[in-house]
Every structure is written in C-alpha cells, then in structure tokens.
C-alpha cells in the first residue's frame, strides 16, 4: 500500500504493549547513521496538539516508554517519531491508532506451585498493571478484564492430563500419586477480547508418602 520514503531514516514505528506497559519502538532505515537522533510525540484520538515526551527528545535509542502517557485503557492514542540526521531533512512517521485494551498482550501469570503428598496446590498471584482506577489505585488484570479466567493443566505423563479452570486464584489437583513428578501449566484467558497468555510452567514433585513407615 505504501511506497517507502526515499530518505530511509525511519521505519516500523509501532507500539509494543504487554500487561498495559506501552513501549513505542522503531527501526532506523538504511540511511540512518550513529548520529541520527529521534524525538517522540504523542496525542489522544481527535486531539490535534502533539505533546513532546520528556526524556525521548533527540535520543539515539530506538524505543520510548509511553506507559504513563497512554495509561487510560479506554482511550485511543497515536505517537510519532521524528528522525533527524546531520544535514538532512527531518522524517516523521506515526503509529496506527493504539488502544492498550485492544492491543496489549497478556504475560504469563505469577504462580506458586505447592506440592503435597497426594495433591498439588497452585496459587495465582494478582497481576498489577499501570492502569489506574478513578480513585487512583493500580488495577489488576482481573479488574480490567471482568471475563478473565485461568486454565490449569497438570501433565501426569505424555498420555494423561488433568484440567481445571475458573476465576478464583486457588486451585488444587487431587488424587495424585506420591513421590511423582508433574508438569503444571497455567494460562490467562480473556474471551471477549480473544487474549491468551503464554503459560506459566512449573515442574513439581509430590511429596513421598511417609505414613507407611510408621504403620
């Protein structure tokens, strides 16, 4: 659709967002050199005034953290980068319309896997995001995605798996063999926006059954 600019100073300006941490990234084109510097601006949908991002003016690195500037997850944003190289004209490129709610990817959950003799307990820890509620506290993923649930799998061996899923944070796989190694995986899913995290994986071994020794 687009004929690339002949200046070749700047390309692929885009947001990369994970758990609502929104990083603007870009590449230098074939004409960029070590003295090429980049300046970043951002704005909300429908606003015409671009705002300069402090700390991302005339920089040489090819990324800029815009999390705080784009932290309203119901808003649409744009960012643009202007590249300047010695003696040449500036080149500006802007992102596509960005919504962290739509575009953020979900990281694997933080989980503690606790082995017992005949069961394995899995405790999912809440994931805080930079998104603020109206009263100013940081929202968890669960508070942002009301449909969020966890899918848990326990691989007993190559042929047999156990499954649990739900919205709660504490789970227990029961009826396991003592002193046996299991592979657990826990994934976050948000069906409405079709998001799925990579799984958190834990390898745990149930505790040996010591009761027979005292019988």
């Amino acid at each position: 659709h687009t004929t690339v600019d002949t200046s070749g100073l700047l390309q692929h300006v885009k947001f990369q967002s994970s758990n609502f941490e929104n990083i603007l990234t870009w590449d230098g084109g074939p004409a960029s050199t070590s003295d090429t510097v980049y300046s970043v601006e951002y704005k909300k949908y429908g606003e015409r005034k671009w705002l300069a991002k402090a700390g991302c003016q005339r920089i040489t690195q090819k990324f800029c953290n815009l999390t705080m500037e784009t932290r309203n997850h119901t808003e649409f944003y744009y960012a643009k980068v202007t590249a300047v190289s010695a003696g040449g004209p500036p080149v500006t490129k802007m992102t596509d319309r960005f919504s962290s709610l739509q575009h953020t990817t979900i990281k694997p959950p933080d989980v503690t896997c606790i082995p017992k003799v005949r069961s394995i307990q899995m405790l999912v820890h809440p994931t805080l995001t930079p998104v603020l509620s109206e009263d100013g506290h940081q929202l968890t993923l669960e508070e942002i995605f009301h449909d969020l649930f966890y899918r848990l799998e326990l691989h007993v061996n190559h042929t047999y798996q156990m499954h649990l899923e739900g919205k709660q944070r504490e789970y227990e796989f029961l009826g396991l063999t003592p002193d046996t190694e299991f592979l657990g995986s826990i994934t976050i899913l948000t069906p409405i926006l079709s998001k799925e995290s990579a799984p958190y994986v834990c390898r745990v071994k149930t505790l040996p059954d010591r009761t027979w020794a005292y019988s």
Partner: antibody
Framework: EVQLQQSGPELVRPGTSVKISCKAS????????MNWVKQSPEESLEWIGE????????TYNQKFEAKATLTVDQSSNTAYLQLTSLTSEDSAVYYC?????????WGQGTTVTVSS | DIVMTQSPSSLAVSVGEKVTMSCKSS????????????LAWYQQKPGQSPKLLIY???SRESGVPDRFTGSGSGTDFTLTISSVKTEDLAVYYC?????????FGSGTKLEIK
C-alpha cells in the same frame, strides 16, 4: 500553510478505472491520517475510508471496500484514491481530507464523470 | 452504521437574524474517555470544499467567527448562528466520528432572504 492539491477532472468510460491524486504541502504526509470523501447530489457526503500514510494501514467504509483502494507515495508526499469498475453511480466529486476524526483540511475536490 | 439526521433541509433568513439547525444521531456520540461528543460541523459554500467549523460538538475551529456556536450532547446537537451575515450562505453538514464508518448528515441549506 497546509494545502491539499488534487488532480484535475476525469471523464472516464463505464467499466474502467481512475486514480486520483492528492499532494500534501506545508506538512509531512506521514504525520497525519488521510481520508477520502465522496460527494454526489444523491448521497450528500460519504466517507470512503482512511489511510495512515506512515504504515499504509487502511480502514474502509464497507460500502466502498470493493470499489476503492487507498495508497500513498511517501517520497512525493502524495495520497491516491483508485476507483475500479466504474458506473454512472460513481460520478461525483471526490475529496481528500486530513486528520483522524474530523477533517481540518480538505482538497479542492476532483470531479469524476462516468459516461459512455 | 450511525445515521445522522439533519433538519430542516433548508431555511431562509434575513441578515442579522439568529439561526439554529439540528443534527440527531441514531446512537449516542459521547466518548466515555473524555466525556466529549464525537461530532463536527462543516460549512460548504457554493463551488467550494467543506470547511471545518466545530469539533467535539462545541469547540470552535481557529479562525471561525464567534457567531457560530455548537451545542448538544448524546444524540441531539445544534449549530447556532447568532447573527447571520450574507457570507454565511452555504450548506451545513454534521459528521460523527464516534465509530466507523464515519457518517455525515444530509445537510441544511441556509439561504438569505
């Protein structure tokens, strides 16, 4: 001063295609979205679609998806609207218009007349 | 698609009179993140391109005379010209940018008596 200069009027045969240009000056084409709007006596103003000249990403009005193709040439600061399989219903004035929501600058319009 | 309905389709007034024209949308245009309405007004004089007058329902574009005022919220919007001048002879269009596809009203033609 921001200006959008469109190509001249077109008289074309039914079934053929036409490509209209919109050259931006006074700003970098890649610093804002470009939209295209159709104006005909029957339908008033109709939004055809938008393009992000930096990425080439397009969003079309479903009504025009099979009819219109939006492109840009960054090196010449020019946006294009191509219309295919023309019929008399495509006879209209076509405008390019800048910005991502409402439209703050408009080209002067290109009249397309489809006639055998 | 959001349907924009303008009324009246035309009106004739004398110089110096106050004019109001209506634009109604088939669904609310209130953008929750900034509590503004995604509505713009344009003026198109004979033989010219449309010109932006008002955006966010009530923000006047730079250089537009202050006799032009936009108001309203949700689904009902109004453009008011407080004291019409001869150069205001034009067709006035509203446009929503709340959701794709962006849509326009069919216009109100202002004629001078």
């Amino acid at each position: 001063e921001v200006q959008l200069q469109q190509s001249g009027p077109e008289l074309v045969r039914p079934g053929t295609s036409v490509k209209i240009s919109c050259k931006a000056s006074g700003y970098s084409l890649t610093a804002d979205y470009m939209n295209w709007v159709k104006q005909s006596p029957e339908e008033s103003l109709e939004w055809i679609g938008e393009i992000n000249p930096s990425t080439g990403t397009t969003t079309y009005n479903q009504k025009f998806e099979a009819k219109a193709t939006l492109t840009v040439d960054q090196s010449s600061n020019t946006a294009y609207l191509q219309l295919t399989s023309l019929t008399s219903e495509d006879s209209a004035v076509y405008y390019c218009a800048r910005f991502d929501a409402y439209f703050d600058y408009w080209g002067q319009g290109t009249t397309v007349t489809v006639s055998s | 698609d959001i349907v924009m309905t303008q009324s009246p389709s035309s009106l004739a007034v004398s110089v110096g009179e106050k004019v109001t024209m209506s634009c109604k949308s088939s669904q609310s245009l209130l953008y929750s993140s900034n509590q503004k309405n995604c509505l713009a007004w344009y003026q198109q004089k004979p033989g010219q391109s449309p010109k932006l007058l008002i955006y966010w329902a009530s923000s006047r574009e730079s250089g537009v005379p202050d006799r032009f005022t936009g108001s309203g919220s949700g689904t009902d919007f109004t453009l008011t010209i407080s004291s019409v001048k001869t150069e205001d002879l034009a067709v006035y269009y509203c446009q929503q940018y709340f959701s794709y596809p962006f849509t326009f009203g069919s216009g109100t033609k202002l004629e001078i008596k």
